[in-house]
Amino acid sequence: IWELKKDVYVVELDWYPDAPGEMVVLTCDTPEEDGITWTLDQSSEVLGSGKTLTIQVKEFGDAGQYTCHKGGEVLSHSLLLLHKKEDGIWSTDILKDQKEPKNKTFLRCEAKNYSGRFTCWWLTTISTDLTFSVKSSRGSSDPQGVTCGAATLSAERVRGDNKEYEYSVECQEDSACPAAEESLPIEVMVDAVHKLKYENYTSSFFIRDIIKPDPPKNLQLKPLKNSRQVEVSWEYPDTWSTPHSYFSLTFCVQVQGKSKREKKDRVFTDKTSATVICRKNASISVRAQDRYYSSSWSEWASVPCS
Amino acid sequence: RNLPVATPDPGMFPCLHHSQNLLRAVSNMLQKARQTLEFYPCTSEEIDHEDITKDKTSTVEACLPLELTKNESCLNSRETSFITNGSCLASRKTSFMMALCLSSIYEDLKMYQVEFKTMNAKLLMDPKRQIFLDQNMLAVIDELMQALNFNSETVPQKSSLEEPDFYKTKIKLCILLHAFRIRAVTIDRVMSYLNAS
């Protein structure tokens, strides 16, 4: 058993049928010695008397808010949460496996640049009685500071019969140098509590590996005289690290017909312009990627050929 | 359709082309190592990230773009010793910081070159003959060093008398390649920045 926060405790249980559970001793936070009784949640049934209460915690029915009283007055509370260990592996019931980029990916994180700011998000089908708390650091043995905001509900989607909820959090490394070569990964830790169930999820990454630039901005077409060709031009996104000559991007230019089945013409360039043939009803899209370290491509920025 | 990669004209900053080749070569070598050594801990998540140049060179600090010198987090350990020769410097652009930057890159390359050559000698003794260093990568390191053209003492190749532990050598190779790839990215950024200056 360990303390998650004041008056909230997590009991770690080896979770299998007929498991013996864990013996837990609760102590009433009071100078009083006599006439103390204990109850669980809203029940008025007295579980025991005395300054301490010994309970065997086996199932969720044994978890909850234990309260000690004296003469009708509440003295203190202890909330017990359960953390299930199933065959040596902590349970992951609360969050959905996003399966990208690999199985058992519960937290996904992205950064728009090298400033040390990043966003993480996760999915759940649970809509109520759910709280999250996020901590982060650079490295784990001698951790350096990363400050995270509060997790917020950022999207709701309908998936088949289920509703899916996306939560996200923004974090900022306290003293980040965009040009630094990372040798210690960023660690992100999310505590999730659903009703009386506690779970924790972690992700470890280098900022360089989660970079995903914003799409190029100011995408424009300039027809070339007496030709089916057009000059496409664009600019670096505002959110990208500067100077651009140091933090350079490379670009992919795509000409896509109306039908998804039509052959796509793709051109790769380090410049911020390209000459392509613009077909009727086609659209031109451009996306960006770090020129020197192949992390994710940005989303596409698009304009119609007409 | 891929656009052919533009080759820099001779008037351009002469090291840019070599640094691009370096990054390509080390990335290819790392990919080859990951595939060949699939039963070894060779992914970025599994290895310890060690920098053999730590406390010996200061490439990131010495090569910091001017725009980032205002960022206090980037100024933890700015070096102040200066070396001023090297053929990548167009004379009118010669500056103390630029010379220090390029000499630091040269020292990095020299250190990695020695490590890789020592390691290759060990890998050649492996009866499994599982993996060797790409000669192209070693040649590209050499070319960039020649282009930088700094005078410095030659570092003797380390020789080891004890029987090599091939498992450890292969893990060390992965660690070195990951670190060298990160340094090659920095070198490429620096060359691109200097070329634009």
């Epitope: 299998y16 049928p17 007929d18 199932e59 199933e86 065959d87 040596g88 592996i89 019931d93 199985n103 | -």
Partner: antibody, heavy 115, light 112 residues
Framework: QVQLVQSGGGVVQPGRSLRLSCAAS????????MHWVRQAPGKGLEWVAF????????YYADSVKGRFTISRDNSKNTLYLQMKSLRAEDTAVYYC????????WGQGTMVTVSS | SYVLTQPPSVSGTPGQRVTISCSGG????????VKWYQQLPGTAPKLLIY???PRPSGVPDRFSGSKSGTSASLAITGVQAEDEADYYC????????????FGTGTKVTVLG
């Protein structure tokens, strides 16, 4: 004490269907994940499928994906394995078992796929 | 499709020490715990070892499990006639959990 009693096995022709049941008692069935494991005659143990305690997630071996469906009825304390498009290579003793560091197995039920 | 490799058979005379190996990889045994089962003919498997080395109550202390790196082993110290059975190791793969990974199985024969 924990008990898992299996039923539903038998002889079936290739291409036909069969449903296995596993009745649980002696524990809070709705709190635990459950597996199906099979063993072809003279062969080793092969995992077939898993279902979460609340039925929200199901996992299958590649060899049965798309043909077998694992399900549970927590109100009846019963686990099921619906097997469709059965093949000769599905012939095996099928076991249900609880998920956890200490597990409990059913007695096994024989499924024979033969023409 | 078995990822965990065991010797097909091992044998010993009563009182001898018999060991069975179970060889896996970094993503399974290297990252997860190992269980060992005993299966007597015509019966369901019985748990002998969980979490690499602990024994459930009721399992004789002549059975012991260990794990090192990407391999595990089961030792029977002072093998007895009633130990003649098939033995299976089991673990998980970190990418496919909760799918159970079973070893290929080992037939233990007690001679004499």
């Amino acid at each position: 004490q924990v008990q898992l009693v299996q039923s539903g096995g038998g002889v079936v022709q290739p291409g036909r269907s069969l449903r296995l049941s596993c009745a649980a008692s002696g524990f809070t069935f709705s709190s635990y994940g459950m597996h199906w494991v099979r063993q072809a005659p003279g062969k080793g143990l092969e995992w077939v499928a898993f279902i979460r305690y609340d039925g929200s997630n199901k996992y299958y071996a590649d060899s049965v994906k798309g043909r077998f469906t694992i399900s549970r009825d927590n109100s009846k304390n019963t686990l099921y394995l619906q097997m469709k498009s059965l093949r000769a290579e599905d012939t095996a003793v099928y076991y249900c078992k609880t998920h956890g560091s200490h597990d409990n197995w059913g007695q096994g039920t024989m499924v024979t796929v033969s023409s | 499709s078995y990822v965990l490799t065991q010797p097909p058979s091992v044998s010993g005379t009563p009182g001898q020490r018999v060991t069975i190996s179970c060889s896996g990889g970094r993503s399974n045994i290297g990252s997860n715990t190992v269980k060992w089962y005993q299966q007597l003919p015509g019966t369901a498997p019985k748990l002998l070892i969980y979490g690499n080395d602990p024994r459930p109550s009721g399992v004789p202390d002549r059975f012991s499990g260990s794990k090192s790196g990407t391999s595990a082993s089961l030792a029977i110290t002072g093998v007895q006639a009633e130990d003649e059975a098939d033995y299976y190791c089991q673990s998980y793969d970190r990418g496919t959990h909760p799918a159970l990974l079973f070893g290929t199985g080992t037939k233990v024969t007690v001679l004499g």
